[in-house]
């Protein structure tokens, strides 16, 4: 794909609360791949905000592809029932908020956050980097949004809306206005290069989010993190071209890459998904 090719696209008005994805790949377009098999799979549709069926060709494609509807929901919705705002003031937390913190079996010593059901607060813990459970958040804010109660004892909704205590209406929460090209791609693309724990010297590439380029580094052969690719092309494909562009007001914007138009206007802010 030539990065010089550009297309102009127009934003459509679909009033929805701000979309907050569990995994960046949930924003990827359903991709049947180049092969010709007919395999029933599921993908998360950012427009309808639901997991839907599609036909997969059997090879390539992308990570927004699941064997079952349940798996899709588990990966791309915060909680299988989390779109329903309760008529009571207390919105249910996802089940995983009640799991104990779990470091997993590996030795990464990564700072993460978990909801402590004893103290009713999100707390820091050291995650080993593998296994563990879903009560594991990269930021304190994300943990609080999903698992902690709001100030008046009601749950903050995953889309940044709260149930108004007076009239049971949805009230938008104040949101920071993000920059035009804020990075919202795979979170591992933002992590620094990590040699890992072993003694090998393997040539790898990592995405340097400061300069926006893939750079070589020496990998030890074990441990480290996901910002680790065997080729520059693979690094670029995963990190350079998969981010979400956000703008604060509607209008016309240019998006690189010749591919089908994919646009959705969100209330309070717009999310633009660049096709992978």
């Amino acid at each position: 794909d030539s990065e010089e090719d550009e297309e102009h696209t127009i934003i459509t008005d679909t009033e929805l609360p701000p979309l907050k994805l569990m995994h960046s790949f949930c924003a990827f377009k359903a991709d049947d791949g180049p092969c010709k098999a007919i395999m029933k799979r599921f993908f998360f549709n950012i427009f309808t905000r639901q997991c839907e069926e599609f036909i997969y060709g059997g090879c390539e494609g992308n990570q927004n592809r699941f064997e079952s509807l349940e798996e899709c929901k588990k990966m791309c919705t915060r909680d299988n029932a989390n779109r329903i705002i309760k008529t009571t003031l207390q919105q249910e937390k996802p089940d995983f908020c009640f799991l104990e913190e779990d470091p997993g079996i590996c030795r990464g010593y990564i700072t993460r956050y978990f909801y402590n059901n004893q103290t009713k607060q999100c707390e820091r813990f050291k995650y080993g980097g593998c296994l563990g459970n879903m009560n594991n958040f990269e930021t304190l804010e994300e943990c609080k949004n999903i698992c902690e109660d709001g100030p008046n004892g009601f749950q903050v909704d995953n889309y940044g809306t709260q149930l108004n205590a007076v009239n049971n209406s949805l009230t938008p929460q104040s949101t920071k206005v993000p920059s035009l090209f804020e990075f919202h791609g795979p979170s591992w693309c933002l992590t620094p290069a990590d040699r890992g724990l072993c003694r090998a010297n393997e040539n790898r590439f990592y995405y340097n989010s400061v300069i926006g380029k893939c750079r070589p580094f020496k990998y030890s052969g074990c441990g480290g993190n996901e910002n680790n690719f065997t080729s520059k092309q693979e690094c670029l494909r995963a990190c350079k071209k998969g981010f979400i562009q956000r703008i604060s007001k509607g209008g016309l914007i240019k998006t690189k890459r010749k591919r089908k138009k994919q646009r959705v206007k969100i209330a309070y802010e717009e999310i633009f998904v660049k096709n992978m």
Partner: antibody, heavy 120, light 107 residues
Framework: QVQLQQSGPGLVKPSQTLSLTCAIS??????????WSWIRQSPGRGLEWLGI?????????DYAVSVKSRITINPDTSKNQFSLQLNSVTPEDTAVYYC??????????WGQGTLVTVSS | DIVLTQSPATLSLSPGERATLSCRAS???????LAWYQQKPGQAPRLLIY??SRATGVPARFSGSGSGTDFTLTISSLEPEDFATYYC?????????FGQGTKVEIK
Amino acid sequence: QVQLQQSGPGLVKPSQTLSLTCAISGDSVSSSSAAWSWIRQSPGRGLEWLGIIYYRSKWYNDYAVSVKSRITINPDTSKNQFSLQLNSVTPEDTAVYYCARHSMVGFDVWGQGTLVTVSS
Amino acid sequence: DIVLTQSPATLSLSPGERATLSCRASQYVTSSYLAWYQQKPGQAPRLLIYGSSRATGVPARFSGSGSGTDFTLTISSLEPEDFATYYCQQYSSSPITFGQGTKVEIK
């Protein structure tokens, strides 16, 4: 050199409990750099991970959803071993059961395997 | 769950030939947490590769590569003792899962 020695019955009746033990030599069940697992293998299902225990300041476990309601893996620090209990077995639980050590690079040490047949 | 799909199911090759075994994951797997095992009839599996490193005592003809969702085990020149079944396994996220295996048989 780390070794794992499995013991337990090879025949279990349907609805009963399958119990196997894995004795560890050359490492400690309480090691903070290892984890201890049970895996089974049957012709129909291939290699199937059942569960894992590990000690990181306290004991943790994780079980496969397919057996979660029926499985318990327990450490025995005094004997330096760990055990598998699988309740309410059916003929589908017939398999070769392996215990294995996970040393953060994969399952690097395996027990010899125990063929468990569930039959009346 | 992360589903690991191995291909081909069977690989028929002669000693001295190069074997390339594929393991494709249904979701992202951290490459450090993908392992390869060799199993011979009547024996327990044996760890060969973790990430792209060889386990202790594994000959240099075995190598692992790949990242993301596509991983490869390569045996550069097959020896008679290499004819066996090979499994990939991930422990990036719970539950731990194995591929269904690739049998490398003598042609």
